[in-house]
Amino acid sequence: GDMLIEKTIKREVVLEEGTTAFKNWVKTGTTVYRQFWIFDVQNPDDVAKNSSKIKVKQRGPYTYRVRYLAKENITQDPEDHTVSFVQPNGAIFEPSLSVGTEDDNFTVLNLAVAAAPHIYQNSFVQVVLNSLIKKSKSSMFQTRSLKELLWGYKDPFLSLVPYPISTTVGVFYPYNDTVDGVYKVFNGKDNISKVAIIESYKGKRNLSYWPSYCDMINGTDAASFPPFVEKSRTLRFFSSDICRSIYAVFGSEIDLKGIPVYRFVLPANAFASPLQNPDNHCFCTEKVISNNCTSYGVLDIGKCKEGKPVYISLPHFLHASPDVSEPIEGLHPNEDEHRTYLDVEPITGFTLQFAKRLQVNILVKPARKIEALKNLKRPYIVPILWLNETGTIGDEKAEMFKTQVTGKIK
């Protein structure tokens, strides 16, 4: 019996036309929501004038439905047993699951003003940009609607730059009508232990963002893993959101709608400094903000964001060093609310429930030539928002899964 089940699983998890896995892989049957909490700055003038601690108050959730679009350009390559595809991006606002509307306003860091002196460090260029910042009446902070902040707005300062640059700014701009990929993954036909593992991303086996092995694209996209998952296994996956591969370790066994699943969690040492976890040395790419690579819990992904000073962390700076969170007031990190986990059904390797939590931060530094920033006495890694992307197998699907997989094994 076990042999037959194993044979069936091996057949059904292959990513090719006609299998159970393929159908769910092309278009997930799970409803995925992305909740946003925006960090509303309470004392913008005090910070800009006196370099005070930044007082923030989170507002949310503002919920969008995401990952509802089917994969596109699906192409099987029988030669190397891979399948390539792109994942279209789309987000639909869900008013009933939100505390307000997309027109709600927030006081947040002025993304363009903060980024300008970081991207253009030359003093001559900064003097010129300062004129434009003043002319556009821009300052260190700005008031923007949720819709603008997430999906993009025409920046008044950038609009004055007489060079052909993008004048639209937004944390996720551009998002709708864009795609993630091309991904090329192993279909598992020749070797089931490689199924869904990414062979290349955007035509490359490495990211070109990090030195050494940190640049590798490891594992799957976390939607599924090769079958017969053991608790001792480290699940490796690549997340384009954070521009790196990461890993999860076994946390606990839980019951999900009658299906036994393994909860894998992102461990704190994935965000540790090289001092605590030497494996992370290649994720520390600059020495100043990181206090000579001793700070932890934030990841500088600027190289992946056209040089913009974007830092990724866990929400509320969970698992981050005190020096990172010290200049910010109003953060309350909480392991249960702010950690990322994957609930993986061990026989099939399918992720039946997940919660991906991350925070987007922008570095702002003192800049003598930029009037809006010249009173700052220290750099700040400013939280802009945090998100919780969740998906859970539907009741109907869960019943079907129990009948076809776990039920048969029992």
Epitope: S123, F124, V125, Q126, V127, S131, K369
Partner: antibody, heavy 118, light 104 residues
């Protein structure tokens, strides 16, 4: 010692183009922004153009905008000013200058005289 | 453009102050002893003095106004002094019209 040597001046015809070159020595040229400044006979100083250290950013004074191009060759330690469609009012002494940072000149060339006349 | 007085005069040994306003960034002060001769930087970035410039020359800035000072003026300091900087427009750097210093 910091030296800036301009060349390329002389008598020019209106409507034609001229190319001035500044050869730098005595410092790490690729670390500095460079400017061209001119002075018409009997008048004050007028900023003409500027270029940042790696040549990616350029800026021009109102009087020459659209007619001037500033460029640099860090390998040769030279900065060039190309001025098209010359006018009588472009007559003057053109100085190459080094920016100490934030648009504040700390070294000047000896200048090259340009006369635009038919 | 930047605003500076058109002329100042002083006796040898006196202190001379020239102000310049209207700038948006660091100021420089440039000495030109005769028309057509190359300017010489006497102060850059508000208060920095090139190594070959005598210590009697100094500069300071507060807000959008810069002050250039010669403490103990000498006959050889007679020249036109230009202030230079940035006026906040997008048309590059600017200079004042020049201040003629006469040593009596």
């Amino acid at each position: 010692a910091v030296t800036l040597d301009e060349s390329g001046g002389g008598l020019q015809t209106p409507g034609r183009a001229l190319s001035l070159v500044c050869k730098a020595s005595g410092f790490t040229f690729s670390s500095y922004n460079m400017f061209w400044v001119r002075q018409a006979p009997g008048k004050g100083l007028e900023w003409v153009a500027g270029i940042d250290d790696d040549g990616s950013f350029t800026l021009y004074g109102a009087a020459v905008k659209g007619r001037a191009t500033i460029s640099r060759d860090n390998g040769q330690s030279t900065v060039r000013l190309q001025l098209n469609n010359l006018r009588a009012e472009d007559t003057g002494t053109y100085y190459c200058a080094r920016d100490s940072g934030a648009v504040s000149i700390d070294a000047w060339g000896h200048g090259t005289e340009v006369i635009v006349s038919s | 453009a930047l605003t500076q007085p058109s002329s100042v005069s002083a006796n040898p040994g006196e202190t001379v102050k020239i102000t310049c306003s209207g700038g948006d960034s660091d100021y420089g002060w440039y000495q030109q002893k005769s028309p057509g001769s190359a300017p010489v930087t006497v102060i850059y970035q508000n208060d920095k003095r090139p190594s070959d410039i005598p210590s009697r020359f100094s500069g300071s800035a507060s807000g959008s106004t810069a002050t250039f000072t010669i403490t103990g003026v000498q006959a050889e300091d007679e020249a036109v002094y230009y202030c230079g900087g940035w006026d906040g427009s997008y048309d590059g750097a600017v200079f004042g019209a020049g201040t003629t210093l006469t040593v009596l």
